[in-house]
Interface confidence: low
């Protein structure tokens, strides 16, 4: 009874299409494929950059898988073919790996990337990114922003750079349709009259880096003798109700009373006959329903209510 | 590990010329500026000058300026420091010292090399 | 040129003391949200060793009782606790503007 073996994939590769950390990953049939013509051959593709302790494993009939990786680092990977059981008449049969690796050979010292990278999706509506110069590098330097997602072409420049001393130090980015719940690649390189210049490469999603705007239209009611009913309006924008989270803080007499988060645009605050003097702040940020992650608004205005009956009267703003 | 390894000790007359080495392992050379710093006996210190390893570009502290020639040689990765015109106040000992530029610091030095300047 | 002020330019302190060094510069040395002030310990005989770049960064290896602090042009060094192998000559020195520039010193002794 002959063993039944099969071989690798060919031509393993790993190709960069220039979308900055998006890349692909390329083999063709494994050889003497000719006894199996009735089965359908399986793939099991497993890659990570390098220094990551766990591999992502893929299987696949296709000759082809694509997915972000971090250009900071090398990227390995192996490939070997499945023949599952019903193609042998027993045990599933697998290839030895094929591997290869990528990475783009680093210019300068690490010292010369651009330092503090700091992104900001405003409002959901604009994004703007800035850094700082790399420690030492000289005034000659400059840096250049590129990005990409998938809707793109090819990776494009920052057309709108923030300048200090004639040095670019942020970008503000033009409406980006269709661009979030999607990878975003960044690479901010440079050039030096007489340095190399370490690249920096960036992936995040925009929903994840959103800062709202602050909560308006603050206003307390009576709702009784012991109860206020604290309630503010969501901030002009794209960004829907339901998305928010707020955290509240609360001062009663110049002391601070209570802080809490909620999820909608009320809070309702036990009082006593003593307070003289009550003021509360609010702020936004995208809650767990739209977004992994998220930036805290700035504080709403004050909004404070000294001395007198609240069932009068209702404060706005 | 990161090494600077200077020349041995001089003596020179007055007027004439002296020419320090400094040779660099453990670190892409070319990656780095070279600094020289000068240091009197029980005095502070002074910076003389920084050459690029990668371009040659040099920069001199204008005092230097005119009597000390900042030279590399990529090929063995030594740097040196060539002092013309030497006169008694130049008796002092030469650092050379690595940095990448400006904020980064000098931070590896040299052994240090002393001059005497006696007729 | 800048010119780097340090003081005290001696003092006298004892193991498990905290020493505090302080430089001021002629005009301040910050660009780019970096503050371009490196300080260095010197012992007699030996080469200077980076302590602190960047005004706040550590170099690499050194203990963490050093640190630094300030921007501008009021910089501080701080030892928060002596050790035997601290008693040094310090100096700061200002790498914004050629020609880079260094403070007199402040030679710290045991007491």
């Known amino acids: 009874d002959t063993e039944i073996k099969v071989n690798p994939p060919q031509d393993f590769e790993i190709v960069d299409p220039g979308y900055l950390g998006y890349l692909y990953l390329q083999w063709q049939p494994p050889l003497s494929l000719d006894h199996f013509k009735e089965c359908t051959v399986e793939y099991e593709l497993k890659y990570r950059n390098i220094g990551s302790e766990t591999w992502k494993t893929i299987i696949t009939k296709n000759l082809h898988y694509k997915d972000g990786f971090d250009l900071n680092k090398g990227i390995e990977a192996k490939i070997h073919t499945l023949l599952p059981w019903q193609c042998t008449n027993g045990s599933e049969v697998q290839s030895s790996w094929a591997e290869t690796t990528y990475w783009i050979s680093p210019q300068g010292i690490p010292e010369t990337k651009v330092q503090d990278m700091d992104c900001v999706y405003y409002n959901w509506q604009y994004l703007l990114c800035s850094w700082k110069p790399g420690i030492g590098v000289l005034l000659d330097t400059n840096y250049n922003l590129f990005y990409w997602y998938e809707g793109l072409d090819h990776a494009l420049q920052c057309v709108d750079y923030i300048k200090a001393d004639g040095q670019n130090i942020g970008c503000r980015f033009p409406y980006l349709e269709a661009s979030d719940y999607k990878d975003f690649y960044i690479c901010v390189n440079g050039s030096s009259e007489n340095k190399p210049i370490r690249s920096s490469y960036f992936t995040f999603q925009l929903q994840n880096i959103v800062k709202p705007l602050p909560p308006v239209y603050l206003t307390f009611t009576r709702e009784s003798s012991c109860e206020i009913k604290l309630k503010w309006s969501i901030p002009l924008g794209p960004i829907p109700a339901r998305c928010f989270d707020y955290e509240i803080e609360i001062r009663e007499d110049d002391t601070t009373l209570v802080t809490a988060t909620v999820e909608n645009e009320t809070y309702t605050l036990k009082t006593t006959n003593e307070t003289r003097q009550l003021c509360f702040v609010v702020r936004s940020k995208v809650n767990i329903y739209c977004s992994d992650d998220g930036i805290w608004s700035e504080w709403s205005d004050k909004q404070c209510w000294e001395g007198e009956d609240l069932s009068k009267k209702t404060l706005l703003r | 590990q990161v090494q600077l390894v200077q020349s041995g000790a001089e003596v020179v007359k007055p007027g004439a010329s002296v020419k320090l080495s400094c040779k660099a392992s453990g670190y892409t050379f070319t990656n780095y500026w070279m600094n020289w710093v000068k240091q009197r006996p029980g005095q502070g210190l002074e910076w003389i000058g920084r050459?690029?390893?990668?371009?040659?570009?040099?920069h001199y502290n204008q005092k230097f300026k005119d009597r000390a020639i900042l030279t590399v040689d990529k090929s063995t990765s030594t740097a040196y420091m060539e002092l013309r015109s030497l006169r008694s106040e130049d008796t002092a000992v030469y650092y050379c010292?690595?940095?990448?530029?400006?904020?980064?610091?000098?931070?590896?030095w040299g052994q240090g090399t002393l001059v005497t300047v006696s007729s | 040129d800048i010119v780097l002020t340090q003081s005290p330019s001696s003092l006298s302190a004892s193991v498990g003391d905290r020493a505090t060094i302080t430089c001021r510069a002629s005009?301040?040395?910050?660009?780019?949200?970096?503050?371009?002030m490196n300080w260095f310990q010197q012992k007699p005989g030996k080469p200077p060793k980076l302590l602190i770049y960047a005004a706040s960064r550590q170099g690499s290896g050194d203990p963490a009782r050093f640190s630094g602090s300030g921007s501008g042009t009021d910089f501080t060094l701080t030892i928060s606790s002596l050790q035997p192998e601290d008693f040094a000559t310090y100096f700061c020195?200002?790498?914004?503007?050629?020609?880079?520039?260094f403070g007199g010193g402040t030679k710290l002794e045991i007491k």
């Open positions: 020195q200002q790498s914004k503007e050629v020609p880079w520039t």
């Open positions: 005009e301040s040395v910050d660009n780019y949200g970096i503050s371009f």
């Open positions: 050459i690029d390893a990668y371009a040659g570009e040099t």
């Open positions: 010292a690595r940095g990448y530029g400006d904020a980064y610091g000098m931070d590896h």
